[in-house]
């Protein structure tokens, strides 16, 4: 912590200006009004203070506003938005989409995912929900950003808003992720035709149930391996040699690339090695012939 | 050991039919489509079609679709490519090979002469 | 039916270079071709499949790259064993055609 002094007459700052470069960081705490510098904060950022020098500027703001910075502060952070913690971010309240970009910016080619993620909590929490305009800001700015919410912020996006979303937009989305914008998805692209409906449900698929996976399996889609690696393990497992094959169509030949991997390697292990035989692919592991399968968890669920 | 073994060498008169044959061992022969490629002196390699042990699908190129013939023996273990009507362009050495491409047999010369 | 136009059709190189051989498919086969090399009098060897998996026993210094339509194989510091003719093949459906061949000669 700055030690506290009292400001040279000579030091003491009436506005925030370039001068203030040469000023030691207990000078900046002795000689800089909390509140002038909240109302000066659009001249910060051009000023080529030393990281030092920020952290004393953020001491101040962070004394003047204990509950969290008001919007006008935010929106002029710059570069102090890099000495931010996601503790610090958790206390404001942000729902101007210029604040958003110009934070997003900032923070570009800085280790910072954590504090992004929390800023665009806070934006959807301050906007009531995750709308069009926020969702356009998010992929033009930070791809990959939409996948740093919770799924529970992730369940106010309307349906209407998912068309908006991009392929790349959804690669670092988790399961739960996916299971709460799949559904919204099928809402949002039902009146497509087959094929234009699965070029766009594809990105959400890691999110869709069995009987959705089974239904794509009877429209020849031909699904890349790729997107069925990100299927869910539940959703795959209930699938026949039959369905699977004419799920992949022709990228069934990937299923050998990947016989060692979930969710491919606990599919075979549940298929007739008779019925893996089918494909030709040379896959292995699959219940022997001759063997009985007992379903134990049907005498389970009715005990 | 796991190999794919074929006669080395067939010699057949012009119009004549023959039937090449691939015995699979040290491996799963149902669970692998097996492959025919074919391969004239000097010149690159041609897929001519592949059968699959197991259903007995076969997939042919439309190019010797009229004239090939793919087959299999299970309970041998053997694969059977017969050609018919055979003319000069026949003559080449014949591959099998099994799907995954790990696997290719020694190549039968087939030589059609009178 | 898929078309694989592959190039340079032949290419002489000495022992310790680097080459590169490329395969250009007629249309998107994602990452299924695989590279074969092929010694006079001799059955093809398979050397990657899956664009740039290693088939078990062959060389590192052999490595595939590529998707979709576009694929290379480069082999570094080239071994006296190394020449010969080198083919890709697609393996997305059938008909499963092959490019032309790349023979490898010494310089």
């Known amino acids: 912590d700055v030690e506290r002094t009292t400001c040279p007459p000579e030091k003491e700052v009436h506005e925030i200006d370039e001068s203030l470069i040469f000023y030691k960081k207990r000078e900046l705490e002795a000689c800089v009004d909390a509140a002038l510098l909240a109302a000066q904060m659009d001249r910060v950022d051009a000023i080529p203070f030393t990281y030092e020098q920020l952290d004393v500027l953020k001491h101040k703001l962070d004394e003047l506003y204990p509950q969290g910075y008001p919007e006008s502060v935010i929106r002029h952070l710059g570069h102090l938005f890099l000495k931010m913690s996601p503790e610090d971010i958790r206390k404001w309240n942000v729902t101007s989409l210029e604040t958003l970009k110009a934070l997003l910016k900032v923070s570009k080619g800085h280790e910072m995912s954590a504090q992004v993620a929390t800023l665009i909590d806070r934006v959807v929490v301050g906007r009531g929900q995750l709308d069009k305009d926020t969702v356009d800001t998010l992929t033009a700015f930070c791809p990959g950003c939409l996948c740093s919410l919770s799924p529970e912020r992730l369940s106010s996006v309307p349906p209407s808003v998912i068309g908006a979303v991009r392929p790349q937009d959804l690669d670092t989305c988790g399961p739960r992720q996916l299971d709460v914008l799949y559904p919204k998805a099928r809402l949002a692209f039902q009146n497509m035709s087959g094929s234009e409906y699965f070029v766009k449900i594809r990105p959400f698929l890691g999110g869709a149930p069995t009987e959705d996976v089974k239904a794509l399996s009877q429209q020849n889609v031909s699904m890349d391996l790729a997107t069925f690696m990100k299927l869910r393990r539940e959703a795959v497992l209930p699938l026949t040699v039959a369905e699977v094959q004419k799920l992949l169509g022709p990228h069934v030949e990937g299923l050998k690339v990947e016989e060692q991997h979930s969710p491919v390697r606990d599919w075979i292990l549940k298929q007739r090695q008779d019925d893996l035989d089918t494909l030709g692919l040379g896959l292995q592991g699959g219940i022997p012939n001759g063997y009985l399968i007992l379903d134990l968890s049907v005498r389970e669920a009715l005990s | 050991q796991v190999q794919l073994q074929q006669p080395g060498t067939e010699l057949v008169k012009p119009g004549a039919s023959v039937r090449l044959s691939c015995r699979a061992s040290?491996?799963?022969?149902?669970?692998?489509?097996m492959h025919w490629v074919k391969q004239r002196p000097g010149q690159g390699l041609e897929w001519l079609g592949n059968i699959n042990p197991t259903t007995g699908d076969i997939n042919y190129n439309e190019k010797f679709r009229n004239r090939a013939t793919l087959a299999v023996d299970k309970s041998s273990t053997t694969a059977y490519l017969q050609l018919t009507s055979l003319t000069s362009e026949d003559s080449a050495v014949y591959f099998c090979v099994r799907h995954d491409g790990f696997l290719w047999g020694q190549g039968t010369t087939l030589t059609v002469s009178s | 039916d898929i078309q694989m136009t592959q190039s340079p059709a032949s290419l002489s190189a000495s022992v310790g270079e680097t080459v590169t051989i490329t395969c250009r498919a007629s249309e998107n086969i994602y990452s299924y071709l695989a590279w074969y090399q092929q010694k006079q009098g001799k059955s093809p060897q398979l050397l990657v499949y899956y664009a740039k998996t290693l088939a078990e026993g062959v060389s590192s210094r052999f490595s595939g790259s590529g998707s979709g339509t576009q694929f290379s194989l480069k082999i570094n510091s080239l071994q006296p064993e190394d020449f010969g003719t080198y083919y890709c093949?697609?393996?997305?459906?059938?008909?499963?055609?092959f490019g032309g061949g790349t023979k490898l000669e010494i310089r």
């Open positions: 040290g491996y799963s022969f149902s669970s692998y489509w």
């Open positions: 093949q697609h393996q997305f459906g059938t008909p499963r055609t």
